[in-house]
């Protein structure tokens, strides 16, 4: 069937449309196009005779039409009047006619729209605004955009006039946005430029900053006021109800107590005609004096005296604070604060309580610190130490001993030999000593402030022959795979070489053996049961040598996994069952048995006479070493056959 297709169906003014013919019959004489839905000679656009290949314009021909050889009609530079139906009349060679009608619609290319408003400065919560999209265009669809988004759902937004008018009721400051309208028809879509809605609002209740209401005498007062407002608010300041100035900021330098009072900021919006005020009460305090610390005992004695530190001056309604070593007070039962925190008491002072101590007075604005105070704690003397630690010397050398004891004030020292006072010095020097200088050397330290004295006695032996050494140990019963043991060869002697033997052999190379302290100390790390050997140390110098008695290391170990003997697990009924349990352990372990999980006896040997099949089951031996704190066990299944 002959049909006409319009491409496109919706045509923009000024563009072109092709009336495309489908199923054109063959053997044609010619064809003709007409404006309208029927063949009307007065509305003929153009005819085409195939034989002459000539197009003949009709009364409705505008010069904008082209008829193609396939009978399709192109209409150019489309105008609004071209809208409607077009009929193709086909004359076949047998002079039989055929007709088909097509149509298209013409729409204008829309102009760029613009937005008109009935109120350029609406007031918040009072006015409504109606935006209208211009121009009014027939067959156009109107759309609205707020901040480039489609309209939000809101009871305050209403579309009318075929969506051409957007009304905002009771505008708010949040309606301050970019508004655009868009016009659409089937052939074009255009958006307007943005219109920014300028909503007048405020002023809101002003805020005064800073929020601080307490000041010190002599400071500057600088208050700033701000209120949300469009247009921006005009500000006025009042102090105690009296107008001061029309500025957003109020500045008063070097304030005094007389500047205390109520400070009011008034914000005014000239467009909305509204005023809002906020009041803040400012208090100016006189400058407090700098605090200082007094003490009831300037030279307390360690472990005897208490000290009370008081923060001066006493001021009513004041908070007192304390710091020790630049830190807040530690929690300690020896530190006590009075009810008002003004007095800090140190009970039974120690040498570590020297400080420094600071107190502070807190007012509304800041904390004033005192100067630091250091306590002079009297202590000591502690037991004096005599150095060097050598106790054996060779004749002919010089003996130089020094004594020191911790003490405040510093100790006074005295030396005694065999109970006889020698000199009141910290050091004792005797040149070219002989065997006669052997004896008891006593250092006495005395604290004149506390009246306390302490002594230390050292035995000095002057001999060409070295004494027989001995071995001291820091751990007489080390646990295997856990403890270390340090052997030290005594005594410490000047210009002496120290040697070690294990089981009569020189020390083996081992990462677990380490010599230190001039070879005088031998350390065994992570001892094992194999380290339970005889250890001997030796000392020698240019004139003599000597060895200690052996010391056998007693290594605690085990219990290892026990062994139950005999190994048999099958017995005949009526036989005696005699099981013995053994576990390597030092010291020997405690043994216990369980049969089928039931405790039996605490012996190394389990004996059951004349067993029966009732004695079938699991026999467990448990071993425990109380010294190592370790346990072990083994289970054996016994079968008794009838």
């Amino acid at each position: 069937k002959l049909t006409i297709e319009s491409t496109p169906f919706n045509v923009a003014e000024g563009k072109e449309v092709l009336l495309l013919v489908h199923n054109l019959p063959q053997h044609l004489f010619g064809y003709s196009w007409y404006k309208g839905e029927r063949v009307d000679g007065n509305r003929q656009i153009i005819g085409y005779v195939i034989g002459t290949q000539q197009a003949t314009p009709g009364p409705a021909y505008s010069g904008r039409e082209i008829i193609y050889p396939n009978a399709s009609l192109l209409i150019q530079n489309i105008i609004q009047n071209d809208t409607g139906f077009y009929t193709l009349h086909v004359i076949k060679s047998d002079l039989v006619n055929e007709e088909a009608t097509g149509q298209f619609r013409v729409y204008p290319e829309l102009p760029k729209p613009s937005i008109s408003s009935n109120n350029s400065k609406p007031v918040e919560d009072k006015d409504a605004v109606a935006f209208t999209c211009e121009p009014e265009t027939q067959d156009a669809t109107y759309l609205w955009w707020v901040n480039n988004q489609s309209l939000p759902v809101s009871p305050r937004l209403q579309l009318s006039n075929g969506n051409r008018t957007l009304t905002l009721f009771n505008v708010t400051r949040n309606d301050t946005a970019s508004y655009k309208c868009e016009t659409q028809n089937p052939v074009s879509a255009r958006r307007s430029d943005s219109v920014i809605l300028n909503v007048l609002y405020g002023p809101d209740a002003p805020t005064i900053s800073p929020l601080n209401t307490s000041y010190r005498s002599g400071e500057n007062l600088n208050l700033s006021c701000h209120a949300a407002s469009n247009p921006p608010a005009q500000y006025s300041w009042f102090v105690n109800g009296t107008f001061q100035q029309s500025t957003q900021e109020l500045f008063i330098p070097n304030i005094t107590v007389n500047n205390s009072g109520s400070y009011t900021c008034q914000a005014h919006n000239s467009d909305t005609g509204l005023n809002r005020t906020t009041v803040t009460t400012i208090t100016v305090y006189a400058e407090p004096p700098k605090p200082f610390i007094t003490s009831n005992n300037s030279n307390p004695v360690e472990d005897e005296d208490a000290v009370a530190l008081t923060c001066e001056p006493e001021i009513q309604n004041t908070t007192y604070l304390w710091w020790v070593n630049n830190q807040s007070l530690p929690v300690s039962p020896r530190l006590q604060l009075s009810n008002d925190n003004r007095t800090l008491t140190l009970l039974s002072v120690t040498r570590n309580d020297v400080g420094p101590y600071e107190c502070g007075i807190q007012n509304e604005l800041s904390v004033d610190h005192s100067d630091p105070v250091i306590l002079n704690v009297l202590y000591g003397p502690d037991d004096p130490t005599i150095s060097p630690s050598y106790t054996y010397y060779r004749p002919g050398v010089n003996l130089s001993l020094s004594c020191h004891a911790a003490s405040n004030p510093p100790a006074q020292y005295s030396w005694l030999i065999d109970g006889n006072i020698q000199q009141h010095t910290q050091e004792l020097f005797i040149s070219n000593i002989t065997e006669k200088n052997s004896g008891l050397y006593t250092c006495q330290a005395n604290n004149s402030a506390s009246g306390h004295s302490r002594t230390t006695v050292k035995t000095i032996t002057v001999s060409a022959e070295l004494p027989k050494p001995s071995i001291s140990s820091n751990n007489s019963k080390p646990v295997e795979d856990k403890d270390a043991v340090a052997f030290t060869c005594e005594p410490e002697a000047q210009n002496t070489t120290y040697l070690w033997w294990v089981n009569g052999q020189s020390l083996p190379v081992s990462p677990r053996l380490q010599l230190s302290n001039g070879n005088r100390t031998l350390t065994l790390f992570n001892v094992t049961r194999n380290d339970a050997r005889a250890y001997v140390c030796g000392i020698q110098n240019s004139v003599s040598a000597n060895r200690s008695d052996p010391v056998t290391l007693d290594v605690l170990y085990g219990p290892d996994t026990p062994i139950i003997s005999p190994p048999d697990s099958s017995y005949l009924s009526g036989a005696n069952l005699n099981l013995s349990c053994h576990s390597a352990s030092n010291p020997s372990p405690q043994y216990s048995w369980r049969i089928n999980g039931i405790p039996q006896q605490h012996t190394q040997v389990l004996f059951i006479a004349k067993i029966t099949p009732n004695n079938n089951g699991t026999y467990a031996c448990f071993v425990s070493n109380l010294a190592t704190g370790r346990n072990n066990s083994i289970v054996k299944s016994i079968t008794v056959s009838a």
Epitope: A55, P59, I66
Partner: antibody
């Protein structure tokens, strides 16, 4: 037999007006559109305008203000009028039939614009 | 206005040769193109219309082709009487416009 014949003044002074007539035979002006085409000496063809069967016209946009095409269907005559001639209007002027392409042409008439 | 450009003002050929004359439109003219032959001292004569349809009485050695903006007139075997000026013309839009012409010369 389709025939078209142009007749004109031959020589015209500058700034004068031109009138050329195209007389057709063998067909009716109610069925055929007539175009005017000119060809300056040694140059190419330039389309001047068209008169449709119903009397509507279209013109070369460059010459539109100086051109006018009309016709008398009963006399089978089409008229080309041109104002304010200049020397560069010197050309051979043809009338030709056809809505789109021009299948019948006259022999043309030569116009010289000179003082 | 649509501009029709014939890039070759002159083309030289020999009798029996195949020659192609080209024409380029400044926009798509949807095959609404005609070709004319004008011999010295004569009026133009239409050869081809609708880009490829031969007019009545035109020898079949003349063929037209093309679409969109590019069109070609081809003479498959040039004869001595084919010495002439050849013009293209678009009728897609009013005003109708011609190309500048291509003169075919016989060597």
């Amino acid at each position: 037999q389709v025939q078209l014949k142009e007749s004109g003044p031959g020589l015209v002074a500058p700034s004068q007006n031109l009138s050329i007539t195209c007389t057709v035979s063998g067909f009716s002006l109610t069925s055929y559109a007539i175009n005017w085409v000119r060809q300056p000496p040694g140059k190419g063809l330039e389309w001047l305008g068209i008169i449709w069967t119903g009397g509507g016209t279209n013109y070369n946009s460059a010459l539109k203000s100086r051109l006018s095409i009309s016709k008398d269907n009963s006399k089978s005559q089409v008229f080309l009028k041109m104002n304010s001639l200049q020397t560069d209007d010197t050309a051979r002027y043809y009338c030709a039939s056809g809505v789109y392409y021009f299948d019948y042409w006259g022999l043309g008439t030569t116009l010289t614009v000179s003082s | 206005d649509i501009v029709m450009t014939q890039s070759h003002k002159f083309m030289s050929t020999s009798v029996g040769d195949r020659v192609s004359i080209t024409c380029k439109a400044s926009q798509d003219v949807t095959t609404a193109v005609a070709w004319y032959q004008q011999k010295p001292g004569q009026s133009p004569k239409v050869l081809i219309f609708w880009a490829s349809t031969r007019h009545t009485g035109v020898p079949d050695r003349f063929t037209g082709s093309g679409s969109g903006t590019d069109y070609t007139l081809t003479i498959s075997s040039v004869q001595a009487e084919d010495l002439a000026l050849y013009y293209c013309q678009q009728y897609y839009r009013t005003p109708r416009t011609f190309g500048g012409g291509t003169k075919l010369e016989i060597k």
